[in-house]
Interface confidence: medium
């Protein structure tokens, strides 16, 4: 079989948007199954027609309604003949149109009066492609060959730039790039103390506007009174916008404020935020826990706990915990140093403990008091010790 791309030059140049019909002539076969191939891949196009010129001469058509850049490439036709694939001479389809941008100017954020560059590149065909730069509505500089780099010495306000690409088919305009001025960041906001203990505080905040420059760090300043002596200053890399303040004094009033910085410098500080560390839990356990049996139940008594340090704050109430070996257990809170215990089983051993609490929590538990089911009273001692008389 003889194959040729009919009347087709080796190169076929078509304007973008125009229709194209490629013709393939097959001689020496009665019923050729003509396939079209583009750049090595079979073309799945249902607009393929066949004309029988004679019994042994066929013409196949590949019809493209409106060519675009992606249709450009190397085309050939092929037929199966006796188990072998015969291919025609290729035709190079070139699609010409207005320039096509491969690189367009990008938005930038720059410090005032700092130099910067913008890039623009466009291709044909047809070549050559020339680039003209625009600053706002003003043309800057004469045509330059593509690709083109625009060097700008600096701007003092937000400015628009675009490029225009020209070739024999016409011109194309790029996107408009906005060059913003960088500025100092805005103050942070929503500053919250998220967790508090007697010596630590966790702080979180929302960053203000970054001034179009990446925020690099934030500073948390801590004082014991707004505007007082600085107790602590912590510089943290961001994100995340959080900080842990350590080694604070318990039960103390503090204030903190935060500012964040970008490459140009720091933001103003946010307003002071007051907070108070928690006090310490009581350090001592109640002493001399003992029990007195009565007809109505069991009276428990212990010695009052005196605060060891002012940081413990006011003490009280006391918390009493008791358990029996039948699994019964309970807790009760009492204001004084004496408690009347009811609801327990006198036939079972009883273990009692007491602690004193404050706003922070309960102090250490006292030595456990074991009240034996045989005792008329009980005394402190190791758990499971029994005293009877």
């Amino acid at each position: 079989a003889g194959l040729k791309l009919m009347g087709a030059p080796v190169k076929l140049t078509v304007s973008q948007g125009q229709p194209v019909k490629l013709n393939c002539s097959v001689e020496g076969m009665e019923e050729p199954d003509i396939q079209w191939v583009k750049d090595g891949a079979v073309v799945q196009n249902l607009d393929q027609l066949y004309i029988p010129v004679s019994e042994q001469h066929w013409i196949g058509f590949l019809s493209l309604k409106s060519v675009e850049r992606s249709d450009a490439g190397r085309y050939w036709c092929q037929v199966e003949d006796g188990g072998e694939t015969e291919i025609s001479q290729p035709v190079w389809l070139t699609v010409e149109g207005v320039p096509f941008f491969t690189v367009e100017p990008k938005d930038l954020a720059v410090p005032p009066n700092a130099p910067f560059q913008l890039s623009c590149e466009a291709v044909g065909p047809p070549e050559p492609v020339t680039i003209v730069w625009w600053r706002g509505t003003t043309k800057i500089g004469g045509p330059a060959p593509s690709p083109s780099v625009l060097n700008v010495t600096g701007v003092t306000q937000s400015t628009m730039f675009s490029c225009e690409a020209h070739n024999l088919k016409g011109l194309a305009s790029s996107r408009t790039a906005t060059v913003h001025l960088q500025a100092l960041p805005a103050a942070p906001f929503n500053i919250t103390v998220t967790k508090l203990s007697s010596s630590n505080a966790s702080v979180a905040w929302m960053p203000g506007a970054d001034g179009r420059a990446l925020l690099q760090s934030c500073t948390v300043q801590v004082t014991q009174a707004p505007g007082g002596w600085e107790v602590l200053a912590v510089v943290v890399p961001v994100p995340p916008f959080t900080c842990l303040l350590r080694d604070l004094v318990p039960a103390t009033n503090y204030s903190l404020r935060v500012r964040c910085a970008n490459a140009l410098g720091p933001s103003p500080y946010a307003d002071w935020v007051p907070f108070q560390t928690k006090g310490l839990a009581p350090a001592s356990a109640p002493q001399n826990l003992h029990a007195i049996r009565t007809d109505s139940g069991l009276i428990l008594e212990w010695e009052e706990v005196i605060p060891e340090a002012p940081l413990e704050g006011p003490l009280g109430p006391y918390k009493l915990s008791w358990v029996q070996d039948n699994g019964t257990q309970d807790e009760l809170t009492v204001e004084g140093t004496r408690a009347n215990l009811t609801g327990w089983d006198p036939q079972k051993d009883l273990i009692v403990r007491v602690c004193v609490s404050n706003a922070v929590g309960c102090g250490p538990w006292s030595q456990p008091l074991v009240v034996s089911s045989h005792d008329r009273a009980g005394q402190q001692g190791p758990p499971h010790s029994r005293t009877s008389w």
Epitope: N45, L46, D47, K65
Partner: antibody, heavy 125, light 108 residues
Framework: EVQLVQSGADVKKPGASLTISCQAS????????ISWVRQKPGKGLEWMGQ????????MYGPSFQGHVTISADRSTATAYLQWRSLEASDTAMYYC??????????????????WGPGTLVTVSS | SYELTQPPSVSVSPGQTARITCSGD??????AYWYQQKSGQAPVLVIY???KRASGIPERFSGSSSGTMATLTISGAQVEDEADYYC???????????FGGGTKLTVL
């Protein structure tokens, strides 16, 4: 004169298999493609797929891929549309169409000019 | 999957111009074809390759295509033109054909 003669109407139960046919005459069968088009009662036309001139290559619409098989016998100039397992939703009129391929007198393409009269398939339990 | 969108119905008086539109993303690249189907009959090709009239079709039928929209125009519609009209084209890669949903033309 170009003629496409389709097999007669058929009533089947869901799950049954079925093959309908389209016999071409009045032209060289291998000069053209054959397409199948479905039309459900009171609804529009749906392109199901086609088989090329040499019965060697088929193309299917996305909704029909895997559900039907298009084939052809060049020796009898007949195209076929086959179901392995019919569903009630297959109830429709099925047309075979002589598709683009060769051209009339080598000039004007006869795109989808010739349609068969249609085969009515009813699937009902 | 690819879709071609047509208005469900168009009404005109006899002698008026009827326009039926068909929109699809691939129409800038792929040709549109138009079919007429009268009640109980097989469809008949009216327009192929956007604007070419099929043999035996009256001159009052014309087609055009611009961007993603193809249009069938019937200049001076007749009562006998009352039918369903379908546009037909390929999806962008050319792997399969698609019919539009159809437009019922009423000539009152």
């Amino acid at each position: 004169e170009v003629q496409l003669v389709q097999s007669g109407a058929d009533v089947k139960k869901p799950g049954a298999s079925l093959t309908i046919s389209c016999q071409a005459s009045g032209y060289t069968f291998t000069d053209y493609w054959i397409s199948w088009v479905r039309q459900k009662p009171g609804k529009g036309l749906e392109w199901m797929g086609q088989i090329n001139r040499h019965a060697s290559n088929t193309m299917y619409g996305p909704s029909f891929q895997g559900h039907v098989t298009i084939s052809a016998d060049r020796s009898t100039a007949t195209a076929y549309l086959q179901w392995r397992s019919l569903e009630a939703s297959d109830t429709a009129m099925y047309y075979c169409v002589r598709s683009g391929g060769a051209t009339s007198g080598g000039t004007i393409p006869e795109y989808y000019q010739h349609w068969g009269p249609g085969t009515l398939v009813t699937v009902s339990s | 999957s690819y879709e071609l969108t047509q208005p469900p119905s168009v009404s005109v008086s006899p002698g008026q111009t009827a326009r039926i539109t068909c929109s699809g993303d691939a129409l800038p690249k792929k040709y549109a074809y138009w079919y007429q189907q009268k009640s109980g009959q097989a469809p008949v090709l009216v327009i192929y390759e956007d604007w070419k009239r099929a043999s035996g079709i009256p001159e009052r039928f014309s087609g055009s295509s611009s961007g993603t929209m193809a249009t069938l125009t019937i200049s001076g519609a007749q009562v006998e033109d009352e039918a369903d009209y379908y546009c037909y084209s390929q999806e962008r890669k050319g792997n399969y054909f698609v019919f539009g949903g159809g437009t019922k033309l009423t000539v009152l």
